[in-house]
Interface confidence: medium
């Protein structure tokens, strides 16, 4: 399933970096979230549960990330113009069933004021 | 699983149009292939098998397409500069298991010579 464009503010700029917000429904217990730039995997985070509800977080492509009960935020630093691109949150839901994949995204525009180190 | 950039010639230009080639492994028997422009679904084709190996082709978002045993080609006509974008082949494999999603893509550059109706 492809959701298309994110219907929330996906990019939050601060201090020459950007927080990319990837939301998921709060009933989702186990999932994989990947951040794609174009078609490339930039970041990858999997949350699963085991015995005694022990949570396991696995990251094959590690990025600075922050996990809440309904979102994963990935942080990109030292922005420059090459960061301008389509970014997608690729969510694979394992639990609850059925298995489902959703892709949401948007274009990251880079303006002068958001660059990390503006030339004075 | 995300494969990222297509490692084959994805865009084939002819007569002011473009053929977008979406490949899949020839062992795949049942699948859904979607063509995405940015994060939007442009085209959608599902191939399934029923009793007696009867093949069923379903298209929710219809585009002119061509199916072979290892690819789906989608055809876009009357190219103009607004067609320039990231295009992704979003393949969902149903059979053989396990269920798997791969995304491959690339940027469609539109040059003067490829436009359908060049201004003279």
């Amino acid at each position: 399933e492809i959701n298309g464009s994110a219907n929330y503010e996906m990019f939050i700029f601060h201090n020459g970096g950007v927080q990319i917000l990837c939301k998921y429904p709060d009933i989702v217990q186990q999932f994989k979230m990947q951040l794609l730039k174009g078609g490339q995997i930039l970041c990858d985070l999997t949350k699963t549960k085991g015995s005694g509800n022990k949570v396991s977080i696995k990251s094959l492509k590690f990025c600075h990330s922050q996990l809440s009960n309904n979102s994963v935020s990935f942080f990109l630093y030292n922005l420059d113009r090459s960061h301008a691109n389509y970014y997608f949150c690729n969510l694979s839901i394992f639990d609850p069933p059925p298995f489902k994949v959703t892709l949401t995204g948007g274009y990251l525009h880079i303006y002068e004021s958001q660059l990390c180190c503006q030339l004075k | 699983e995300i494969n990222g950039s297509a490692n084959y010639e994805m865009f084939i230009f002819h007569n002011g149009g473009v053929q977008i080639l979406c490949k899949y492994p020839d062992i795949v028997q049942q699948f859904k292939m979607q063509l995405l422009k940015g994060g939007q679904i442009l085209c959608d084709l599902t191939k399934t098998k029923g009793s007696g190996n009867k093949v069923s082709i379903k298209s929710l978002k219809f585009c002119h397409s061509q199916l072979s045993n290892n690819s789906v080609s989608f055809f876009l006509y009357n190219l103009d500069r607004s067609h320039a974008n990231y295009y992704f082949c979003n393949l969902s494999i149903f059979d053989p298991p396990p269920f798997k999603v791969t995304l491959t893509g690339g940027y469609l550059h539109i040059y003067e010579s490829q436009l359908c109706c060049q201004l003279k």
Epitope: Q29, Q30, K32, T46, T48, K49, G50, S51, K54, S56, K58, S92, F94, D95, P96, P97, P98, F99 | P97, P98, F99, K100
Partner: antibody
Framework: EVQLVESGGGVVRPGGSLRLSCVAS????????MSWVRQAPGKGLEWVSG????????DYSDSVKGRFTISRDNAKNSLYLQMNSLRAEDTALYYC?????????????????WGQGILVTVSS | EIVLTQSPGTLSLSPGERATLSCRAS???????LAWYQQKRGQAPRLLIY???SRATGIPDRFSGDGSGTDFTLSISRLEPEDFAVYYC?????????FGPGTKVDIK
């Protein structure tokens, strides 16, 4: 093509030990949680043990807890079951099975790929 | 542990007929963590249905699953010759994960 191949079965006396192995091919092994399921001759299926993608989380059925140990070596695409203090009631065909989603968990997941099974016979 | 009871033990039907298999849990299986497997003699089990009602990949649409809580059913709309086998339900909600004793579907 995905294949799971078990080995290490055989005949052993009560109180003895065996180590079963399951080698996976055609798959990114560390994407998957794995389980062992057994089937006594002419009987139904019984889940024995499960392990998550990196071996950090394991679980066992009450009937084997304290006697069996599940482990994995992702570099070798291999899953293991160390069986100690074997009893006659452990006689069964042992299957290794893979998590359906590729979630890395054995928990809250059904099994899609199974090996063909390896026979363990405990008899004096 | 959650005990699963399957009925009937044996179902004798002819090809083309509809089969309805039942699985009852001793306590509620939350969020539908229930699967159905088919096993033919001398073969490993094959996943048919997961999440109580979702068909696994490559499974024909004559197989369907339904139910929630403690009562679940597997239906085969029109039996094909290759469908005669043993069917197991499996709960993967609570450890230890358990299977039902199986229902054998044989040719009348």
């Amino acid at each position: 093509e995905v294949q799971l191949v078990e080995s290490g079965g055989g005949v052993v006396r009560p109180g003895g030990s065996l180590r079963l192995s399951c080698v996976a091919s055609g798959v990114t092994f560390d994407d998957y949680g794995m389980s062992w399921v057994r089937q006594a001759p002419g009987k139904g299926l019984e889940w024995v043990s499960g392990i998550n993608w990196n071996g950090g989380d394991t679980d066992y059925s009450d009937s084997v807890k304290g006697r069996f140990t599940i482990s994995r070596d992702n570099a070798k695409n291999s899953l293991y079951l160390q069986m100690n203090s074997l009893r006659a009631e452990d006689t069964a065909l042992y299957y290794c099975a893979r998590d359906f989603y590729g979630s890395g968990s054995y928990y809250h997941v059904p099994f899609d790929y199974w090996g063909q099974g390896i026979l363990v016979t405990v008899s004096s | 542990e959650i005990v699963l009871t399957q009925s009937p033990g044996t179902l004798s039907l002819s090809p083309g007929e509809r089969a309805t298999l039942s699985c009852r849990a001793s306590q509620s299986v939350s969020r539908s963590y229930l699967a159905w497997y088919q096993q033919k003699r001398g073969q490993a089990p094959r996943l048919l249905i997961y999440g109580a009602s979702s068909r696994a990949t490559g499974i024909p649409d004559r197989f369907s699953g339904d139910g929630s809580g403690t009562d679940f059913t597997l239906s085969i709309s029109r039996l094909e010759p290759e469908d005669f086998a043993v069917y197991y339900c499996h709960q993967y909600d609570m450890s230890p994960f358990t299977f039902g004793p199986g229902t054998k579907v044989d040719i009348k």
